[in-house]
Interface confidence: low
Amino acid sequence: LEVQVPEDPVVALVGTDATLCCSFSPEPGFSLAQLNLIWQLTDTKQLVHSFAEGQDQGSAYANRTALFPDLLAQGNASLRLQRVRVADEGSFTCFVSIRDFGSAAVSLQVAAPYSKPSMTLEPNKDLRPGDTVTITCSSYRGYPEAEVFWQDGQGVPLTGNVTTSQMANEQGLFDVHSVLRVVLGANGTYSCLVRNPVLQQDAHGSVTITGQPMTFP
């Protein structure tokens, strides 16, 4: 029995619903009473949802899954996963058994956009050219881990003296904090770009520092 799933991962935003597509070709005379359908986590074998003995056996996965009962007879064994969480990310296997048996695995890639970065300076007053300043770029509640890039006002990448930390909250979403240490010129703009590698989404933040003229005694 040939079971078909998409080759590419299904990308779902945290909090939205995702459809994990799975289909088979029913033979003439096929009835749902013959169908055994099991969705499970590929790695741990944990049951997610099942259909057996002509009945939807329900969700075994925090009551957030559903089949498409009206489409099952046409060979559509897709699974709807509601309110996607980071922890849902991974491979799901669709097992279909009629007289013959087939299975295939589909990957779920979870994503969440990063917030617009907030920029902070330390120290934040009485700045003069030649002073060393710490600029912190903070972006919140994204997934997966971000790529962070710094550049100056001319678009030149700044790679030295950058420290980036990413911490996962209880939902598995990342808060990213990237710190750039620079010596101020007469004036300058410093930009931080936080990129979500799955969504190919960039969040930008920038700060412009206008230094006071240097004075000599």
Epitope: N36, I38, T44, K45, Q46, L47, S50, A52, Q57, G58, A60, Y61, A62, R85, V86, A87, D88, F95, S97, F101, S103, G172
Partner: antibody, heavy 118, light 112 residues
Framework: EVQLQQSGPSLVKPSQTLSLTCSVT????????WNWIRKFPGNKLEYMGY???????YYNPSLKSRISITRDTSKNQSYLQLNSVTAEDTATYYC????????????WGQGTSVTVSS | DIVMTQSAPSVPVTPGESVSISCRSS???????????LYWFLQRPGQSPQLLIY???NLASGVPDRFSGSGSGTAFTLRISRVEAEDVGVYYC?????????FGAGTKLELK
């Protein structure tokens, strides 16, 4: 009603192979997981492994070099083989189904008491 | 492997009274999906194990509601209210979070 009926010898000689059969009625062996568990004298339970609805297997690493779980879908039977047995393999052996709702252990066979002795 | 510990080898109880049986796991059995993968089985003398509780607190089909399960990620309790003679046997906890599945050593329920 799903029923699991076990059969096999109750006495096996050391170094030989222990072979047991789990016959399933009231449900297809091509659905769900079919597990083997054993209970040693003194009540300790050990999970041995499974054969899945697709025919893939998992074996407890502690037994991996000696165990084989197979099936015959036409007979609706699952088979356990344990090679090179010693007296430490004396136990009661059970087959059990991985259930739709429960994940494990909603139906069990009656158990087969196996003694390894010469 | 996850180690399951049942510290009491046996518990005596008077028929009609309540009793609690405890179990601990060496690792949290709370999955990120919100389920806790702890099972309870009863093996009566001369019988096969019978599933009582699945996913820590769900009563298996046909099991009297005198049985209930509770716990946290690593500490679990099976409570039997109004104990009856048919409740005698060995109670096992089991984790289903990871393979290999592992069982506790068992707690024997004895009537006073």
């Amino acid at each position: 009603e799903v029923q699991l009926q076990q059969s096999g010898p109750s006495l096996v000689k050391p170094s030989q192979t222990l072979s047991l059969t789990c016959s399933v009625t009231g449900g297809s062996i091509t659905s769900f997981y079919w597990n083997w568990i054993r209970k040693f004298p003194g009540n300790k339970l050990e999970y041995m492994g499974y054969i899945s609805s697709s025919g893939s297997t998992y074996y407890n690493p502690s037994l991996k070099s000696r165990i084989s779980i197979t099936r015959d879908t036409s007979k609706n039977q699952s088979y356990l083989q344990l090679n090179s047995v010693t007296a430490e393999d004396t136990a009661t052996y059970y087959c059990a189904r991985g259930g739709v709702h429960y994940g494990f252990g909603d139906y069990w066979g009656q158990g087969t008491s196996v003694t390894v002795s010469s | 492997d996850i180690v399951m510990t049942q510290s009491a080898p046996s518990v005596p109880v008077t028929p009609g009274e309540s009793v609690s049986i405890s179990c601990r796991s060496s690792k949290s059995l709370l999955h990120s999906n919100g389920n806790t993968y702890l099972y309870w089985f009863l093996q009566r003398p001369g019988q096969s194990p019978q599933l009582l509780i699945y996913r820590m607190s769900n009563l298996a089909s046909g099991v009297p509601d005198r049985f209930s399960g509770s716990g946290s990620g690593t500490a679990f309790t099976l409570r039997i209210s109004r104990v009856e003679a048919e409740d005698v046997g060995v109670y096992y906890c089991m984790q289903h979070l990871e393979y290999p599945l592992t069982f506790g050593a068992g707690t024997k329920l004895e009537l006073k």
